[in-house]
């Protein structure tokens, strides 16, 4: 058993039929010695008396808020949560496996630039009685500071018969140099509590590997005389690291109709303009990627050909 | 300890081409190592990230773009003295700071070159003959060093009398390649910045 936060404890249980469970001793936080009784949740049934209560925790029915009282007055609470371990593996029931970039990916993180600021998000089908707490650091032994905000519900989607909820959190490395060469990864730890179930999820990464620039901005078209070709120009996104001559991007320019199966014109360039063939009912799209370290491409920025 | 904006005369900065080739060569070599050594811990997640130049050179700090010198987190610089003449310095206006930067890059390349050559000598003794260093990568390191053209004491190639542990050597190769790729990215960024300045 360990303390998650003040008066909230996590009991780690091997989860299999007829498992013996864990013996837990609760102590009432009071100078009083006599006349103390214990109850669980809203029940008025007295579970025991005395300054300590010993319980055998085997299942979710044994978890919950234990309260010690004296003469109708509440003295203190202890909330017990369960963390299940099945076949030596901690349960991952609360969050959905995003399966990208690989199986067992519960947390996904992205950074728009090298400033040390990044966003992580996760998915769940649970809509109520759900809380998250996020911690982060650079490295695990001798960790350096990363400050994370509160996790918030950022999107809701309908997937078949199910609703899916996306939560996200923003974090900022306390003293980040955009030009630094990372040797210790960022560690992100998410504590998830659903009703009386506790789970924790972790992700470890270098900022350089989670870079995904914003799309290029200010796309403009200039038809070329006596030609089907157009010159398309754009600018670096505002959120990209500066100076741009040091943090350079490369671009992919594509002309395509509405369907992905349609024919297309595609060209890669390090410049902020390109010449392509425009077709009726097609769109010109441009996306960006770090020129020197191939992490993710940005989303497309698009303008219609006509 | 940073790069000033007013640097070389217009025209192709001589080392940019070589630094692009360097990044390409080390990336290819790393990819080859990951594929060939698939049953060894050779991915970014599996290896320890070591920097053989740590406390010996200070490339990131010495080559910091002017715009980042206002960022206090970028200025925990280690003072290191370097030789200050080189053919990539395309004009007399080139500052002492830039010479320091290019000299630091030269020292990095020299250190990695020695490590890679020592390692290759060991890998050539491996009866499995599983992996060797790409000669193209070694040649590209050499070309960039020649383009930088700094005079510096020759670092003797390390020779070891004991029987090499080939498993450890291959793990070390992965660690070295990962670190060198990251440094090659920095070098490419620096050369691109200088070329634009």
């Amino acid at each position: 058993i360990w303390e998650l936060k003040k008066d909230v404890y996590v009991v780690e249980l091997d989860w299999y039929p007829d498992a013996p469970g864990e013996m837990v001793v609760l102590t009432c936080d009071t100078p009083e010695e006599d006349g103390i009784t214990w109850t669980l949740d809203q029940s008025s049934e007295v579970l025991g008396s005395g300054k300590t209560l010993t319980i055998q925790v085997k299942e979710f029915g044994d978890a919950g808020q234990y309260t010690c009282h004296k003469g109708g007055e509440v003295l203190s609470h202890s909330l017990l949560l369960l963390h299940k371990k099945e076949d030596g593996i901690w349960s991952t029931d609360i969050l959905k496996d995003q399966k990208e970039p690989k199986n067992k990916t519960f947390l996904r993180c992205e950074a728009k630039n090298y400033s040390g600021r990044f966003t992580c998000w996760w998915l769940t089908t649970i809509s109520t009685d759900l809380t998250f707490s996020v911690k982060s650091s650079r490295g695990s032994s001798d960790p350096q500071g990363v400050t994370c905000g509160a996790a918030t519900l950022s999107a809701e989607r309908v997937r078949g018969d199910n609703k899916e909820y996306e939560y996200s959190v923003e974090c900022q490395e306390d003293s980040a140099c955009p030009a630094a060469e990372e040797s210790l990864p960022i560690e992100v730890m998410v504590d998830a509590v659903h009703k009386l179930k506790y789970e924790n999820y972790t992700s470890s990464f270098f900022i350089r590997d989670i870079i995904k620039p914003d799309p290029p901005k200010n796309l403009q078209l200039k038809p070329l005389k006596n030609s089907r070709q157009v010159e398309v120009s754009w600018e670096y996104p505002d959120t990209w690291s500066t100076p741009h001559s040091y943090f350079s991007l490369t671009f992919c320019v594509q002309v395509q109709g509405k369907s992905k199966r349609e024919k297309k014109d595609r060209v890669f360039t390090d410049k902020t303009s390109a010449t392509v063939i425009c077709r009726k009912n097609a769109s010109i799209s441009v996306r960006a990627q770090d020129r020197y370290y191939s992490s993710s491409w940005s989303e497309w920025a698009s303008v219609p050909c006509s | 300890r940073n790069l000033p904006v007013a640097t070389p005369d217009p025209g192709m900065f001589p080392c940019l081409h070589h630094s692009q080739n360097l990044l390409r060569a080390v990336s290819n070599m790393l990819q080859k190592a990951r594929q060939t050594l698939e049953f060894y811990p050779c991915t970014s997640e599996e290896i320890d990230h070591e920097d053989i130049t740590k406390d010996k050179t200070s490339t990131v700090e010495a080559c910091l773009p002017l715009e980042l010198t206002k960022n206090e987190s970028c200025l925990n610089s280690r003072e290191t003295s370097f030789i200050t003449n080189g053919s990539c310095l395309a004009s007399r206006k080139t500052s002492f700071m830039m010479a320091l930067c290019l000299s630091s890059i030269y020292e990095d390349l020299k250190m990695y070159q020695v490590e890679f050559k020592t390692m290759n000598a060991k890998l050539l003794m491996d009866p499995k003959r599983q992996i060797f260093l790409d000669q193209n990568m070694l040649a590209v390191i050499d070309e960039l060093m020649q383009a930088l053209n700094f005079n510096s004491e020759t670092v003797p190639q390390k020779s070891s009398l004991e029987e090499p542990d080939f498993y450890k050597t291959k793990i070390k190769l992965c660690i070295l390649l990962h670190a060198f790729r990251i440094r090659a990215v920095t070098i490419d960024r620096v050369m691109s910045y200088l070329n634009a300045s």
Partner: antibody
Framework: QVQLVQSGAEVKKPGSSVKVSCKAS????????LHWVRQAPGQGLEWMGW????????EYAPKFQGRVTITADESTSTAYMELSSLRSEDTAVYYC???????????IGQGTLVTVSS | DIVMTQSPLSLPVTPGEPASISCRAS??????LHWYQQKPGQAARLLIA???QSISGVPSRFSGSGSGTDFTLTISSLQPEDFATYYC?????????FGQGTKVEIK
């Protein structure tokens, strides 16, 4: 199986014209760009131009501009390349090629030898 | 027009050995570079698109690398069927242009 079947070899006199055909099978004809590329004996490959069969748009290499015409007939899934004012240096194997991507070729025909000789 | 220069023009290789062909562009073309294989009397066949993207059905022994002006096609272990002429082609701008070709011959 996507295939491009080209017309047979031709022998032409200098100053005349030649029209080579290329019939596509497998996939929808108008879903692809069609190009013509030639190869003179013992020489490398030389791009001549492309057509979008969907709308008839064409683009030609400056070297052939005014001498080459590329057309397409959607009803028969056939593209044509006509080269006029033939000279001996136009002796070459002419290939048609196609792709959903405009700027390179994933399927190439078997070639048509055009010999220009007096 | 962008001029593509291949080297060497002839490459004698022992079967089973690796082979590398170089292609250089007269100006920077990013990764807009494609490789083809042509056997005598046959049409060319696409091997690699956009400098390093492998093409379905092409053996994994063929790989490409490079960007900007310098590109390489590598065949990790030459098989008897790989003896052919190899062409690079740039797609950075029209007109599309090819290298002169590199003939890989049996040593």
């Amino acid at each position: 199986q996507v295939q491009l079947v080209q017309s047979g070899a031709e022998v032409k006199k200098p100053g005349s014209s030649v029209k080579v055909s290329c019939k596509a099978s497998g996939g929808t004809f108008s879903d692809y760009y069609l190009h013509w590329v030639r190869q003179a004996p013992g020489q490398g490959l030389e791009w001549m131009g492309w057509i979008d069969p969907e709308n008839g748009d064409t683009e030609y290499a400056p070297k052939f501009q005014g001498r080459v015409t590329i057309t397409a007939d959607e009803s028969t899934s056939t593209a044509y390349m006509e080269l006029s004012s033939l000279r001996s240096e136009d002796t070459a194997v002419y290939y048609c090629a196609r792709n959903k991507e405009l700027r390179y070729f994933d399927v190439i025909g078997q070639g048509t030898l055009v010999t220009v000789s007096s | 027009d962008i001029v593509m220069t291949q080297s060497p023009l002839s490459l004698p290789v022992t079967p089973g050995e690796p082979a590398s062909i170089s292609c250089r562009a007269s100006q920077s073309i990013s990764i807009n570079l494609h490789w083809y294989q042509q056997k005598p009397g046959q049409a060319a066949r696409l091997l690699i698109a956009f400098a390093s993207q492998s093409i379905s059905g092409v053996p994994s022994r063929f790989s490409g690398s490079g960007s900007g002006t310098d590109f390489t096609l590598t065949i990790s272990s030459l098989q008897p069927e790989d003896f052919a002429t190899y062409y690079c082609q740039q797609s950075n701008s029209f007109p599309l242009t090819f290298g002169q070709g590199t003939k890989v011959e049996i040593k």
